[in-house]
């Protein structure tokens, strides 16, 4: 039962995270939550950083600045892969949840 519940939580978190990405950066509240998660957990996107390419408001050459290894304003623009966190947040935060919840 515990495993089923954990999988359900992970699935919900994944869906919710991707939903919030769709609103980035239009919704300031959403943006600040996602930015905080990405910066704190050193992750980028749901599965990985390429998820941001699919977001209409984000150009192909851009990720949120919170994905950068060294976060500064604009660092997500024209990024190179070595300058950003490539791991996805769902797996990274999920791992933390599994350990701590």
């Amino acid at each position: 039962a515990g495993y089923v519940f954990r999988d359900k939580v992970m699935s919900e978190f994944n869906n919710n995270f991707r939903q919030q990405m769709e609103n980035y950066p239009k919704n300031n509240h959403t943006a600040s939550i996602l930015d905080r998660m990405q910066a704190d957990f050193k992750c980028c996107g749901a599965a990985n950083y390429t998820d941001w390419e699919k977001i209409p408001s984000m150009s192909k050459n851009r990720v949120p600045d919170s994905c950068c290894i060294n976060v500064t304003v604009g660092c997500g623009i024209n990024f190179n892969e070595k300058a950003i966190h490539k791991e996805g947040c769902v797996e990274k935060i999920g791992g933390w949840l599994r350990k701590n919840v």
């Epitope: 050459n61 604009g74 660092c75 623009i77 024209n78 190179n80 070595k82 300058a83």
Partner: antibody, heavy 120, light 113 residues
């Protein structure tokens, strides 16, 4: 003072490769990104790609993926660009230029350019 | 991709005149996080490398005379104004967006009347 010294002109045969250099001086090499820009005779400027000496990261214009390879040698503060499978379309002047970062990418210092002529 | 369109392609001027050239981007280059337009202007004289004049659409590079002024806050429409034109200003002027990859406009050539 800041200088970007590029290698001399190249006359190469179609199908061959060429590697040009850009030696930086007057600043800390790893704190600036090196961009490469193409200019065909009598035409405008076209961005090829950048090399970030801080993390060896690269970014290419889609049009130049597979054509250009960007590298550097930190010990000599030199950036390199290799162009492969050359055709007459690659005949141009190639500039290296630096920018503070890849995102604040206004290019404040430029090399003098390397002229590449592809001819049999 | 973001495309940059410059107009006019050439301008005939006399010394002392004031000229304005335009640069239009196909998408906004305004970054909401810092409210800066990621656009630069360059000057290229015959046989020389390009020289940076303006960055962030309106900030003059150090050493550039204040006769050169960049403006445009819409995110898509930008202008470079040169007042009291000198003969040494005869050159090709390029705008460049830095917001999504890097693309240059086709240039505006400043010639003597």
């Amino acid at each position: 003072q800041v200088q970007l010294q590029e290698s001399g002109p190249e006359l190469v045969k179609p199908g061959a490769s060429v590697k040009m250099s850009c030696k930086a001086s007057g600043y800390t090499f790893t704190t600036y990104v090196i961009h490469w820009v193409k200019q065909k005779p009598g035409q405008g400027l076209e961005w090829i790609g950048y090399f970030d000496p801080n993390n060896d990261g690269t970014k290419y214009n889609e049009r130049f993926k597979g054509k250009a390879t960007l590298t550097s040698d930190r010990s000599s503060s030199t950036a390199y660009m290799e162009l492969s499978s050359l055709t007459s379309e690659d005949s141009a002047v190639y500039y290296c230029a630096r920018s503070r970062t890849y995102y604040d990418a206004s290019m404040d210092y430029w090399g003098q350019g390397t002229s590449v002529t592809v001819s049999s | 991709d973001i495309w940059m369109t410059q107009s006019p392609s050439s301008l005939a001027v006399s010394p002392g005149e004031k000229v304005t050239m335009n640069c239009k981007s196909s998408q906004s280059v305004l970054y909401s996080s810092n409210q800066k337009n990621f656009l630069a202007w360059y000057q290229q004289k015959p046989g020389q490398s390009p020289k940076l004049l303006i960055y962030w659409a309106s900030t003059r590079e150090s050493g550039v005379p204040d006769r050169f002024t960049g403006s445009g806050g819409s995110g898509t429409d930008f202008t470079l104004t040169i007042s009291n034109i000198q003969t040494e200003d005869l050159a090709v002027y390029y705008c460049q967006q830095i917001f999504s990859s890097y693309t240059f406009g086709g240039g505006t050539k400043l010639e003597l009347k």
